[in-house]
């Protein structure tokens, strides 16, 4: 019968011919009376056999990631009779792995959105690298992830590639971060290959800013001839949040005379001071009112950022009109 061991050939061997093993019949007594032949895909081009001894050689550099095994057929013929000594047999040459592929991030570009002020430990995104080397061959495809850029705000779980928040972030200070993740094979041991990817992490807004009046004092004038409902001026607060988190409502906090009102222009986010009752210069020629501003909607958990509403003082001068 046929005699052989399992055949392995390392990939990427640079030698012109690499001895893989021997294929022989147990009837071969070594007197060179038998001829060995190799058939199948790769026979003659990738692998050759010594016709006398049955020694098999690889004569080409192999790439396991391109092809990991070859199925060949062997024949042995009695030179004198030309007859087969053994039935034709099929055998396998396996290409063994070396660490010749770096980890690659296939889902690039990565982008994630996470709410500002999220607590430590909040999951942001998972990045995954793949390594074309053999996962069953040592540590060639066993990856470890690490953070090259992004401290102290982010961390990455070494074995999963899960990125988490490690420090609270304020969108109004910085609204996006570039994080660079490295994946290393060989679980980081010497000879490891690595690949990197960038992750753009954008912070979405939460309502952590209250609106504040830029001016602590406004001076407006109103003619004593102005009818009720007249707009006598605008006041404005600023809120560094965006979208609905910056929507605000103006109101009167103090107006002993109950002469004025404030309505909110939700397009411009300005407060419009309105005359609620007619004024008379001869009766009172100036007024002082205090206005306040609050966000339209503040979730309960964010009330700690909105403890005291901003106010401003408005001095209103009444203009005299000649009366008949």
């Amino acid at each position: 019968g046929w005699v052989w061991n399992q055949f392995f050939v390392p990939e990427e061997m640079n030698t012109t011919s690499h001895h893989i093993g021997q294929l022989r019949s147990d009837l071969d007594n070594g007197n060179n009376s038998f001829q060995y032949k190799l058939l199948g895909a790769g026979a003659g081009s990738t692998f050759i056999i010594d016709e006398r001894t049955g020694d098999i050689y690889a004569i080409q550099k192999l790439d396991r990631e391109e092809r990991s095994l070859y199925i060949l057929r062997a024949q042995v013929i009695d030179i004198a009779t030309g007859r087969a000594v053994e039935p034709e047999s099929e055998f396998v040459i396996k290409v063994s792995d070396i660490n010749d592929n770096e980890p690659k991030f296939l889902d690039e570009p990565y982008e994630a959105i996470v709410p500002e002020m999220s607590p430590e430990g909040t999951l942001v995104i998972q990045v995954t690298a793949s390594d074309a080397d053999d996962p069953s061959s040592g540590n060639n495809a066993r990856l470890l992830y690490s953070l090259l850029q992004g401290q102290p705000y982010f961390s990455v779980e070494p074995t999963t590639g899960v990125i988490r928040i490690s420090s609270k972030m304020d969108r109004e200070l910085q609204d996006e971060y570039w994080v660079i993740i490295q994946a290393k094979d060989m679980i980081g041991q010497p000879g490891a290959l690595s690949g990197t990817t960038s992750v753009l992490i954008k912070l979405s807004d939460v309502n952590d800013n209250k609106p504040i009046f830029k001016e602590s004092l406004y001076r407006l004038t109103v003619s004593e001839s102005a009818p009720t409902g007249t707009s006598i001026g605008t006041i404005m607060a600023y809120d560094n949040d965006i979208g609905e988190n910056a929507e605000m409502d103006y109101s009167i906090e103090e107006d002993d005379s109950q002469t004025f009102d404030i309505i909110t222009n939700h397009e411009t986010q300005e407060g419009i001071v309105i005359l609620k009752k007619k004024v008379d210069f001869e009766h009172q020629n100036h007024y002082g009112i205090r206005a306040k501003v609050k966000n339209h909607h503040v979730p309960e958990q964010l009330m700690k950022y909105h403890t005291e509403a901003s106010t401003t003082f408005i001095k209103i001068q009444v203009e005299d009109v000649d009366e008949p």
Epitope: R171, E172, Q174, N209, I212, N240, T311
Partner: antibody, heavy 125, light 105 residues
Framework: QVQLVESGGGVVQPGRSLRLSCAAS????????IHWVRQAPGKGLEWVAV????????YYADSVKGRFTISRDNSKNTLYLLMNSLRAEDSAVYYC??????????????????WGQGTTVTVSS | YELTQPPSVSVSPGQTASITCSGD??????VYWYQQKPGQSPILVIY???KWPSGIPERFSGSNSGNTATLTISGTQAMDEADYYC?????????FGGGTKLTVL
């Protein structure tokens, strides 16, 4: 790393002028408002002026209004403070300080997150 | 607009130090706190009343209500000995408090 470096300080006679510079590095200078803050020997911090990231707004303390001018050259990553009609009470260490906050946010909300090491101005006859 | 701070505050190591800053309707504004050690530039330790800049330990905390803002340092350490300044915006100008010297006994 993020850095602000002041220069231009020195001894000057009352009534004369001096120009301070503040060179920025390690961050995108053109995206940040910058303040000048001073500190007289043994005294507290006194705000001097601020300029918005694009130079659109400039505000001054009453004590320097009309005498000091804040300006910036974003192409050179440099902030300036031109001080005219100097007085003895202007003697101080002058710091430039970066306004925290992303561009587009209102400057009135933010503190100063990066400071230079300061440059000393002495006004004396 | 004026911000008033006590000139000095003393605290034993490991205890809690409180530094106040008062101003008219200060609770309506945002307050910032700076630490300055001798010969050094100031460092922002609290912004917008109660938020921490990156790298500032959470033993520093802030509050602001009514006419008074407070910087609290819990478990005070010798390294916390410094001058502390509060700051706020009034209209378009910046105002600093006079500063408080914190002594760790």
């Amino acid at each position: 790393q993020v850095q602000l470096v002041e220069s231009g300080g020195g001894v000057v006679q009352p009534g004369r002028s001096l120009r301070l510079s503040c060179a920025a590095s390690g961050f995108t200078f053109s995206r940040y408002g910058i303040h000048w803050v001073r500190q007289a020997p043994g005294k507290g911090l006194e705000w001097v002026a601020v300029i918005w990231y694009d130079g659109s707004n400039k505000y001054y303390a009453d004590s320097v209004k009309g005498r000091f001018t804040i300006s910036r050259d974003n192409s050179k990553n440099t902030l300036y403070l031109l001080m005219n009609s100097l007085r003895a009470e202007d003697s101080a260490v002058y710091y430039c300080a970066r306004r925290a906050g992303i561009p587009g946010t209102t400057g009135y909300y933010y503190g100063m997150d990066v400071w230079g090491q300061g440059t000393t101005v002495t006004v004396s006859s | 607009y004026e911000l008033t701070q006590p000139p000095s505050v003393s605290v034993s190591p490991g205890q809690t130090a409180s530094i106040t800053c008062s101003g008219d309707r200060l609770g309506e504004k945002y307050v910032y706190w700076y630490q300055q050690k001798p010969g050094q530039s100031p460092i922002l330790v609290i912004y917008q009343d109660n938020k921490w800049p990156s790298g500032i330990p959470e033993r520093f905390s802030g509050s602001n209500s009514g006419n008074t803002a407070t910087l609290t340092i819990s478990g005070t350490q010798a390294m916390d000995e410094a001058d502390y300044y509060c700051q706020a915006w009034d209209s378009s100008t910046v105002v600093f408090g006079g500063g408080t010297k914190l002594t760790v006994l």
